[in-house]
């Protein structure tokens, strides 16, 4: 931002009324209304080019200064060619001293040359030549100083002319200040630039009305230079929650719309399924039915929990069951949507009911799944199964009502035994074979069926209380197809895979395990 | 003290010349701006002529132009004005008069300061 | 050329009175006009210059204002040394030009 400048002394705005000083008295200096450009206007001229040495004083009046500390000096003046007064070049010049002096006191008329102090020789970039002046046209110079530190009440600036024929238009003094200024949503004070040039002065800036300095952010602070510039903008505030930037203040949101933090962002509108918030909300409620999450962002809509799953199914495998379903119709507006799997089984002959998920066992965790299946397996046989499918999303927690799908299914068959080949020979072969611990109680004997491989007219059978076997009297390096098959008071159960067994060739050795 | 005064007058018939001076003292002639005026018996002023300080640009009133020749000898601290082809209606007391204007404003043309005592042209058969 | 319109031609006056003597030029001249105070036979005397600034050792009885086309003499306070004729004159261009005058009388 530009400097402000505060003037301490106007010449040219005082028309003529200031009364400087002139020393000699009466000679040298000279104050006369004139007219330039048009326009009267006051000036102090000297003119004593063709008199020899010169030295003659104007001092201004005593000016205070205030918090100044650095004072800047600006001159208008015009200066006229030597070469117009003829015999007049060896003793003209065409330029003036200018000086200052610090005082505690106004010394009145009591001119002392020897307390002031040259501040520089002003010299004019264009003279004026007799052409020229005859048109009444004259160079206007402006040549600008400053001085500092300053330390005293008030001081005096002096012009010594030494033969020059000069017109002393406007002498304007003034100090700078960084202006009042409102940046980053921070107010900085009017602040006095200091006097040295290579400093600049740290000023802290207060938050405008609703904003603050964010979290972790740096407090706002300016740097105010020499020539009343501010520099170095270092941090910044923002407008708090419910407030947004409008130019240089922070506005409350308008109805309808909400900011959750503090931040850069504009207010945003309501989002869907919310009520119309009041003026300066810093979020939108839930219409009835709706939710938020504790994690949701306050610009994402309101959400409710989703519907019971679609079409769920169960399919019986032997002793297991592969439940299958697809998503809600109605999501309520969520992507985070998990299920639970709960099982319940019942007696058939006591109706007696109870939770079953300790003795089966799933596919996957059945709580938080993200896919829409999951195989339950380790069912007793002959029992009634109830497997409950909830849908939950984020906000399933915020309501007692749950969203569930149930399907039923009856195991009426044991799981089949899984079959190993425990060891063979050139005539024997031993097989092994076992099935969930919870059906065992339910198996009266097991049913060992066996053939030759292509022979499919003739078969044997073996039964036993026991897990496992040994088929005899078998021809060597021959091929038998094998299977076994529990059997329950109620009836056969399901029968294992067919597996193939090879007995040894006579080069083999005895009853080797596999 | 400032002084102007004025010599060369007198009675001249019609179309005669006369040539008047104007011996300046008391400040520095090589300065300043210097002036004819004249007053016609029992009328106004008339400005006449006009030099600048260096004797550079000269003007004339409309009445007396191409007749009349302003010039200046600043060695001399004298004004002139060359009167040609007179006639009646030139009679006149003719003024010599100093641009006022101080130190560096000398010349600048305000006005006239310092007027001398008139010296009578009359112009008459 | 720049006219330049004087009135009153006279004025009746007694010693004491505030006079007034406007002088209007045919075009602006800003602030470029000189008052001249005139005894019979005795050369002018300029009392104003830039339309408003008084000559050193004039009595300050006198002022000057206006600027542009519209000017005024004033004084405010009649002497019987000032019954004479006043004339204003245009410096703003060549031709220099002369009011007709303004004689101002004793009553």
């Known amino acids: 931002a530009q400097g402000k400048e505060v003037v301490l002394l106007d010449f040219a705005a005082a028309g003529g009324e200031l009364g400087w000083l002139t020393h000699p008295y009466g000679k040298g200096w000279d104050l006369m209304q004139n007219i330039m450009n048009d326009m009267p206007i006051y000036m102090y001229s000297v003119c004593n080019v063709m008199s020899g040495d010169q030295d003659n004083w104007l001092r201004t009046n005593w000016v205070y200064r205030g918090e100044a500390e650095r004072i800047f000096i600006e001159l208008k003046f015009t200066v006229r060619d030597c070469n117009s007064f003829p015999g007049g070049a060896s003793s003209c010049k065409e330029t003036f001293n200018l000086y200052y002096a610090e005082s505690d006191l106004d010394y009145g008329t009591n001119f002392q040359k020897r307390l002031f102090t040259k501040i520089d020789t002003i010299a004019p970039d264009e003279i004026t030549v007799s052409s020229d002046f005859e048109a009444r046209h004259v160079k206007l110079n402006v040549e600008e100083r400053s001085v500092g530190p300053l330390t005293r009440k008030g001081f005096y600036l002096a012009f010594q002319d030494i033969g020059a024929c000069v017109a002393l238009l406007s002498v304007r003094v003034y100090y700078k200040k960084c202006p009042e200024l409102l940046q980053g949503l921070a107010h900085f004070p009017e602040t006095i630039a200091g006097s040295d040039a290579p400093s600049l002065a740290t000023v802290a800036g207060t938050c405008v009305d609703h904003a603050v300095v964010p979290p972790g952010g740096e407090e706002p602070r300016m740097h105010c230079a020499v020539d009343g510039e501010w520099l170095v903008p270092i941090g910044q505030c923002l407008c708090q929650a419910g407030y947004e930037k409008v130019e240089d203040a922070c506005q409350a949101c308008s109805p309808g719309f909400f900011k959750f933090e503090a931040s850069e962002s504009p207010c945003l509108e309501c989002p869907e399924h919310t009520l119309p918030s009041p003026e300066g909300a810093t979020s939108c409620e839930c219409e009835e039915g709706f939710f938020r999450a504790p994690q949701d962002p306050a610009s994402m809509p309101c959400t409710r929990p989703p519907s019971a799953p679609h079409y769920l199914t169960a399919v019986g495998m032997g002793a297991k069951v592969e439940l299958r379903w697809t998503p809600p119709q109605d999501s309520g507006g969520r992507e985070d949507i998990v299920y639970s799997v709960t099982c319940e089984q019942c007696w058939p002959e006591s109706g007696e009911c109870g939770p079953c998920e300790a003795s089966v066992r799933y596919s996957e965790p059945p709580h938080g799944l993200t896919r829409t299946s999951v195989t339950v397996s380790d069912l007793e046989p002959h029992m009634n199964y109830t497997f409950t499918v909830e849908a939950r999303n984020g906000v399933s927690g915020l309501v007692t009502s749950r969203s569930f799908r149930t399907a039923s299914v009856s195991i009426n068959q044991t799981e089949p035994p899984k079959v190993r080949l425990e060891g063979r020979s050139t005539t024997s072969l031993s097989v092994s074979w076992s099935i969930p611990p919870p059906q065992q109680s339910r198996v009266w004997k097991y049913e060992v069926t066996y053939r030759k491989k292509g022979d499919s007219n003739s078969y044997n059978v073996r039964r036993t209380e026991g897990f496992s076997v040994t088929l005899d009297d078998l021809a060597p390096d021959t091929t038998y197809l094998v299977q076994v098959q529990a059997l329950t008071q109620e009836g056969q159960g399901a029968g294992s895979k067919v597996h193939e067994f090879q007995t040894l060739s006579p080069e083999g050795s005895g009853n080797l395990a596999v | 003290e400032v002084q102007l005064l004025e010599s060369g007058g007198g009675l001249v018939q019609p179309g005669g010349s006369l040539r008047l001076s104007c011996a300046a003292s008391?400040?520095?002639?090589?300065?300043?701006?210097m002036y004819w005026v004249r007053q016609a018996p029992g009328k106004g002023l008339e400005w006449v002529s006009s030099?600048?300080?260096?004797?550079?640009?000269?003007y004339y009133a409309d009445s007396v132009k191409g007749r009349f020749t302003i010039s200046r000898d600043n060695s001399k601290n004298t004004l002139y004005l060359q009167m040609n082809s007179l006639r009646a209606e030139d009679t006149a007391v003719y003024y010599c008069?100093?641009?006022?204007?101080?130190?560096?404003?000398?010349?600048w043309g305000l006005g006239s300061d310092y007027w001398g005592q008139g010296t009578l042209v009359t112009v008459s058969s | 050329d720049i006219q330049m319109t004087q009135s009153p031609s006279s004025v009746s006056a007694s010693v004491g009175d505030r006079v007034t003597i406007t002088c209007r030029a045919s075009?602006?001249?800003?602030?470029?006009l000189a008052w001249y105070q005139q005894k019979p036979g005795k050369a002018p005397k300029l009392l104003i210059y830039?339309?408003?600034s008084l000559q050193s050792g004039v009595p300050s009885r006198f002022s000057g204002s206006g600027s542009g086309t519209d000017f005024t003499l004033t004084i405010s306070s009649l002497q019987p040394e000032d019954f004479a004729t006043y004339y204003c004159?245009?410096?703003?261009?060549?031709?220099?030009?002369f009011g007709g005058g303004t004689k101002v009388e004793i009553k």
């Open positions: 008391g400040f520095t002639f090589s300065y300043y701006r």
């Open positions: 830039a339309a408003s």
């Open positions: 030099i600048y300080s260096s004797g550079g640009p000269t």
């Open positions: 075009q602006g001249i800003s602030s470029w």
């Open positions: 008069a100093k641009d006022m204007g101080t130190g560096f404003w000398s010349g």
């Open positions: 004159q245009q410096a703003n261009s060549f031709p220099l030009t």
